[in-house]
């Protein structure tokens, strides 16, 4: 007997589609074994038709896929297209075709019902719209049209010229009678339900001279597109409802154990808390199609997806729906990456941002979600340099550490940067992560002077106070510009006496600008780091001025002003198209800033680095 | 309120043949997997046949020991659902039971994927 398990017989008609899932025990060698589904030959041999392996055989190109869930014990067939040629005995297993665990599938694809001798058939999702077409002699032209909905041996009347509407398909239906010439009626029916399902007669005219044409409209529950996605990744539906209801409201819901679909994201600004900051409903384009993206995928997102148009904002019978079941892989090729980082009132994060390795030469973005209305996601950095302008000084993008993980350090933190923040870049979509970063209570580790003036021509020399932990961390000094922080040559000087409570391995690492000159204006930061890790940084703005006394000048924290105000964003700031979601600007506003001078050259000293303890704050 | 309400057990000798039928309302759902499960005297809940529905495409499942015996069958929209019992053995007798869920996801075989059950009807086969 096989521990593999499928449903023995499977029936589905022409056209149609078929998921079949196969249940295996999910033991290690199991799991990352061979799955596949076979056709069995009069022979008896077992012909592979799909794998897991990503064989397809000819006869299933483009329209059958095989998809392993190991850590269910689960794979799924999919067959699209059905036809009655697929009709036969198949097995799914596992290994080896010929020897190995496997299960004896029947699929049977019919032709669907008996209908009378010139049915016109009319397959429709519920929700959307049908016009059925009814020709009628010459001699019918002027005689009443009509159009009956058969039930058993019964013709209910569901519309007719003389202004006759039967309530159940009432303020959704209308019959048009075209101008002269035009030999042909048409009934319209908008916001299909499934029980507008049936048999439907046309007639026009009355007596044995009577037009007669049957119509057969099948009203469908879309069948659910099928989506993998891996866990603390993106996933986005795509949503086109048509143009009818392209001024309604829209909606994503999620299929509840009741059946009733609970409300994700609409456009009335309703949304769950289970997605708060990590969810966008993309603006609808012209035709009334949107776009939802969710990142930071759980295991708890799977289910059943509904998008939807309706004035209310929520799923109603009768209006156009489309549908998507959604699996959450929990072997994710998507690394571990904290889900909220920790930062100190005017200390800084460092947040590692995950991106596909395949793609290393992908621009890089770093974007603050916004909850109001369907959520927003305007760009604060990306990798070409760009940064806001009241990010300026205190935000860099560094492709480092490289191989599938870049790193964005922001600094000077206050409690209005507490929020969401997505790590995106302009390929693999599927790659986008959320993270949430938390102001908590504390003092910045790092200690600089607020703000420094310098004097054209002479000798500046910048403090930065380390606490003990840092003793086995690099040391680093840089100047920001709007492109990176470019590294400076830096002195370590001992220990200091910023940290009362601290043995002697705390430390002093000075910048020195000797001779000062006008491009030495602008930001600067000290920071840590552990190889391509970084930690905690501390900014302080130059401000150079002329020469007013001779000699050199020391800044020491006691003498240090508060750091220059933020600038604020300007009106002016225009808003990025969103281009469906390849453009991973997700409503980006976006502001190009000017350099902020020439960046130093120079080699730092060095200084010791080993592991490190913290990153970016704590991390939990 | 929901009800599922089993129907056509009975006694039967070994050999003999038997369709049980069930019926659901008050389902807040066209039921997208209906399944018969078995509880003989002292024992777990087990597997029998199950029936699942996506579209115009339907699913059946059989545990091993009924196959080639036993024919399970519904009406998705009407929310019933039949097993036909063919060669009868002593060791099907158990009370069983009619179980519904919304969706087809999750092992048919297990018990715990189903949302709403019947009071059960008994099968008893001997001679």
């Known amino acids: 007997k096989s521990p593999v398990f499928g449903p023995q017989e499977v029936s589905s008609v022409e056209g149609n589609s078929v998921s079949i899932k196969c249940y295996y025990p999910p033991t290690s060698v199991n799991r990352h074994t061979r799955k596949y589904w076979c056709r069995k030959g009069a022979s008896g041999r077992c012909i592979t038709l799909v794998s897991s392996e990503g064989y397809v055989s000819s006869n299933y190109a483009g329209r059958a896929n095989l998809t392993n869930f190991p850590e269910n014990g689960t794979f799924v067939v999919n067959i699209a297209q059905l036809s009655r040629d697929d009709s036969g005995h198949y097995k799914c297993g596992l290994g080896i075709n010929s020897r190995g665990l496997s299960f004896d599938v029947s699929l049977e694809v019919s032709q669907g019902p008996e209908l009378p001798n010139g049915t016109e058939v009319y397959t429709v999702d519920v929700g959307r719209t049908v016009t059925i077409k009814c020709p009628f002699k010459t001699e019918n032209a002027p005689k009443t049209k009509a159009l009956y909905k058969k039930i058993g041996q019964t013709s209910v009347l569901v519309i007719d010229s003389r202004n006759y509407v039967n309530p159940n398909y009432k303020d959704r239906i209308r019959l048009r009678i075209p101008g002269t010439g035009q030999l042909i009626f048409t009934v319209v029916i908008d916001r299909l339900r499934l029980s507008d399902h049936g048999l439907y007669l046309c007639q026009a005219g009355d007596g044995s001279n009577r037009d007669e044409k049957n119509a057969d409209l099948q009203v469908l529950e879309p069948e659910p597109e099928l989506v993998y996605e891996d866990l603390r990744g993106s996933v986005t539906f795509h949503c086109a409802l048509g143009l009818e209801v392209a001024n309604v409201a829209k909606f994503l819901c999620r299929v509840n154990s009741r059946e009733t679909c609970d409300v994700v994201i609409n456009t009335l600004g309703k949304r769950d808390s289970a997605f708060e900051g990590r969810i966008l409903l993309n603006p609808q384009d012209k035709d009334g199609s949107f776009s939802v993206v969710i990142t930071g995928l759980r295991k708890e997102d799977e289910g059943r997806y509904l998008c939807g148009a309706h004035s209310d904002g929520q799923l109603q019978e009768g209006w156009p729906i489309q549908a998507w079941q959604l699996f959450v892989n929990e072997e994710s090729t998507i690394p571990r990456s904290p889900t909220v980082v920790k930062g100190v009132a005017g200390g800084s994060v460092a947040v590692l941002c995950p991106y596909n390795p395949k793609e290393s030469q992908s621009l890089k973005y770093w974007c603050l979600w916004e909850g109001a209305q369907n959520g927003r996601c305007p760009l604060l950095v990306e990798s070409q340099g760009l940064v806001q302008e009241q990010y300026e000084g205190r935000l860099s993008l560094l492709q480092e550490p490289g191989n599938g993980t870049f790193t964005v350090i922001l600094n000077q933190l206050t409690t209005q940067d507490a929020g969401f923040y997505w790590c995106l870049t302009n390929g693999d979509t599927r790659w986008r992560t959320t993270v949430e970063i938390k102001i908590i209570e504390g003092e910045p580790n790092l200690k600089v002077p607020g703000n420094v003036t310098a004097v054209l021509g002479e000798t500046l020399n910048i403090p930065c106070h380390f606490p003990c932990k840092f003793s086995s961390y690099e040391k680093y000094w840089c100047k920001w510009s709007n492109t990176g922080c470019q590294t400076l040559p830096s002195q370590d000087e001992g220990p200091s006496e910023a940290f009362v409570n601290c043995d002697e391995n705390s430390r002093l690492v000075s910048l020195t600008l000797n001779p000062v000159t006008r491009a030495d204006e602008g930001w600067y930061w000290c920071g840590v780091k552990q190889g391509h890790f970084y930690g905690e940084t501390a900014a302080v703005y130059v401000a150079v001025e002329e020469k007013k006394v001779a000699g050199s000048r020391y800044v020491s924290p006691a003498k240090a002003d508060a750091a220059p105000d933020e600038k604020v964003l300007d009106s002016g700031v225009r808003e990025i198209e969103n281009k469906a979601i390849q453009d991973p600007r997700l409503f980006a506003e976006e502001k190009v800033v000017a350099d902020t001078g020439d960046q130093a050259g120079g080699s730092r000293a060095s200084v010791d680095s080993s592991s490190s303890e913290e990153q970016g704050g704590s991390s939990k | 309120q929901v009800q599922l309400v089993e129907s056509g057990g009975g006694l039967v000798q070994p050999g003999g043949s038997l369709r049980l039928s069930c019926v659901a309302s008050?389902?807040?759902?066209?039921?997208?997997?209906m399944a018969w499960f078995a509880q003989a005297p002292g024992k777990e809940r087990e597997f029998v046949a199950a029936?699942?529905?996506?579209?115009?495409?339907?699913?059946?499942y059989y545990a091993d020991s009924v196959k080639g015996r036993f024919t399970v069958s519904g009406d998705n929209a009407k929310k019933t659902l039949d097993l036909q019992m063919k060669d009868l053995k002593p060791e099907d007798t158990a009370l069983y039971f009619c179980?519904?869920?919304?969706?087809?996801?999750?092992?048919?075989?297990?018990?715990?994927?189903?949302?709403?059950w019947g009071q059960g009807t008994q099968v008893t086969v001997s001679s």
């Open positions: 179980a519904a869920h919304p969706n087809d996801d999750g092992d048919p075989r297990i018990s715990g994927n189903y949302q709403y």
């Open positions: 008050g389902l807040p759902f066209s039921s997208s997997r």
């Open positions: 029936i699942g529905w996506r579209g115009r495409t339907s699913y059946k």
